[in-house]
Interface confidence: medium
């Protein structure tokens, strides 16, 4: 019996269906096929869980959190013992193993390993201004999403005819900050932050209005 090499990892957006591949070749009939799918969750590597089991011509549920969401992609018994996981959750991220036995066929590699990563688009970011908006001051524009896997990057745009930030601005796309030094009337305007990762984007807007000093009355 020989389990085929499977692709190293599968990525899926949260809520979508993941298909975890596992196939094998055997010299024996599929009369005593036994398939166990296990997961080592990323969130708790010390606690492997059973995902689904096929034994004695019957399917059995694994851990409670997989109930009603997991099944074999094809009719069992078969040499393709891939499974699907519906409505994927962040907690489904981990290393999945299919263990295949088909007596009397022994020997060879009977385990297949596939990593599953559940991706999460950036949640709606928060846009904030730090610092005084008085003429000549330094301000920091802050942008941050609470959720997002992989970690979002942040891009700031000034919503004028050029989109480019003022020349006195420096941007950190990892932290989501823009520092604008010595703000002037030209710094005023609507700024948009775009949080993005591999599977999604989300935006927020911020209105920066530079305050000019009031002329002193004599």
């Amino acid at each position: 019996l020989e389990v085929s090499e499977s692709p190293g990892s599968v990525q899926v957006a949260r809520g979508q269906t993941a298909v975890l591949p596992c196939a094998f070749s055997t010299s024996a009939a599929l009369l005593n096929l036994n398939v166990i799918w296990m997961v080592i969750p990323l969130s708790n590597a010390n606690q492997p869980e059973q995902v689904i089991l096929y034994q004695g011509g019957q399917m059995f549920d694994g851990a409670l959190r997989f109930h009603g969401r997991v099944g074999f992609t094809g009719t069992m018994p078969a040499t393709n013992v891939s499974i699907f996981i519906n409505n994927t959750q962040l907690s489904d991220t981990g290393t999945y193993q299919c263990l295949v036995n088909n007596l009397p066929d022994r020997g060879g590699r009977n385990i297949g390993v596939t990593g599953l990563t559940v991706l999460v688009p950036p949640s709606a970011p928060q846009c904030q201004i730090q610092g005084s908006q008085d003429l000549g001051s330094d301000v920091i524009l802050l942008c941050s999403s609470e959720e997002g896997i992989p970690r979002p990057t942040y891009l700031w745009e000034k919503l004028d005819n050029t989109l480019k930030l003022p020349p006195t601005a420096t941007q950190d796309q990892v932290q989501g900050t823009v520092t604008i030094r010595n703000i002037s009337a030209l710094s005023s305007g609507l700024y948009q932050c775009v949080a993005s990762n591999a599977i999604g984007t989300s935006t927020c807007l911020l209105d920066l209005q530079v305050i000019s000093p009031q002329p002193r009355s004599v």
């Epitope: 891009l155 004028d160 775009v194 989300s202």
Partner: antibody, heavy 123, light 108 residues
Amino acid sequence: EVQLVESGGGLVKPGGSLRLSCAASGFTFSNAWMSWVRQAPGKGLEWVGRIKSKTDGGTTDYAAPVKGRFTISRDDSKNTLYLQMNSLKTEDTAVYYCARVAHGGYSGGLDPWGQGTLVTVSS
Amino acid sequence: SYELTQPPSVSVSPGQTASITCSGDKLGDKYASWYQQKPGQSPVLVIYQDSKRPSGIPERFSGSNSGNTATLTISGTQAEDEADYYCSSTGTAHTLAVFGGGTKLTVL
């Protein structure tokens, strides 16, 4: 894998109508700004229009040659983008691509693109 | 309406550096993007926001943009880089992007 698949192209007479569809998968479609771009046979690329995500207002913008004749819409529950084309002219003959606005908002590039669907306007 | 001008064709020997230009009024004030299109295929984004490379695009592709000209540079050009290249200036809140006419890159 991020994927876009267009459909609905074909032969139509001048003055006729056609609706193109673009099925999206592999990303959170409801958050994405989407665009349509066309390419006449043997010619360059021409922007048709874009639609923002509903959370960003869902507003649409169109290129001058198609304004008032073409309408972009989206069905986030079906992960599908549409291009309704009315009052078609022979100069609308082109391969129509849908594409996601990625790597930023207005300043982002189009990535990825679908395989395209051919629209032929001829009598 | 805003226009971007590209040379119709550029030739380069394998391993050499290819430069494709795109000119437009005050283009450096805007963001430029570049797309590669091989015969019978859909366009692929190779550079966005003047000089950023999407994941999966080889490091030999780079971009710059200042004054009236944006430039796509392919260092150590390979046969597989033979394609049409289109520049684009991104639009704003009220305007759509504009594409250049395209440049056919031939790897001799």
